[in-house]
């Protein structure tokens, strides 16, 4: 019997300071290139090593970015979303949605890592 996969969705405000090479991540998504079916949202596709986002540590690949400096990212073309990030200020505030996968085993199931009583 397989366990059920649930998702724990949390939101976080992440304030990044632009480093010498910028914010340091890539995005996918937008109304013209949906990354998730029936969702035109903007998602983090890559965190660049030693970039501002990586050094901060909170932004993760797969996170959905809801807004930049208070500006909603809904219903934007991909390139318009990219422009919004590139042309934002030195201090950038991101509203981010983290989606954490939670594995729920059936009742009475003891996972391999569980200590035996």
């Amino acid at each position: 019997m397989n366990g059920r996969v649930d998702y724990l969705v949390t939101e976080e405000e992440i304030n990044l300071t632009r480093g010498p090479s910028g914010l340091g991540f890539n995005i996918v998504g937008g109304t013209d290139q949906q990354y998730v079916s029936n969702d035109s949202g903007i998602y983090v596709s890559r965190i660049k090593e030693n970039g501002a986002a990586a050094l901060d540590g909170r932004l993760q690949e797969g996170d959905k970015i809801l807004s930049v400096n208070g500006q909603d990212l809904k219903n934007l073309l991909h390139q318009d979303a990219v422009d919004l990030f590139r042309n934002a200020g030195y201090a950038v505030s991101l509203r981010v949605q983290h989606r954490l996968q939670v594995q729920n085993g059936p009742i009475g199931h003891r996972g391999e890592g569980d200590p035996s009583g």
Epitope: L23, V28, S45, Q79, D80, V82, F85
Partner: nanobody
């Protein structure tokens, strides 16, 4: 590799005008988005204006709207910044930035060395 070379900076009186140019050279440049940023002494680098094609978009910082105009000549791989009615607070080093058109990075890929603009 792409090189960006700015020119056109200088000393101008308040109310005067300057036209900055930035030429992109290098085999890999593909007429992607280009922008101007500036950095005043003791301050952080700030966005001034940007231009993109496909679909065409032009953006300005609120502080320069109505005074500065960004344009580009794709045949020459050059972007211009026409600056009118200059104010002392426009004094800064002006930097050109460019990105490859297919880049999904939220950062500009290339930066110039900057050109000084001083408004007295």
């Amino acid at each position: 590799h792409v090189q960006l070379v700015e020119s056109g900076g200088g000393l101008v009186q308040a109310g005067g005008s300057l036209r900055l140019s930035c030429q992109a050279s290098g085999r890999t440049f593909d007429s992607g988005p280009m922008a101007w940023f500036r950095q005043a002494p003791g301050k952080e680098r700030e966005f001034v204006a940007a231009i993109r094609r496909s679909p065409e978009r032009i953006y300005y910082a609120d502080s320069v709207k109505g005074r500065f105009t960004i344009s580009r000549d794709n045949a020459k791989n050059t972007v211009y910044l026409q600056m009118n009615n200059l104010k002392p607070e426009d004094t800064a080093v002006y930097y050109c930035a460019a990105a490859l058109s297919r880049s999904t990075s939220v950062d500009y890929d290339y930066w110039g060395q900057g050109t000084q603009v001083t408004v007295s």
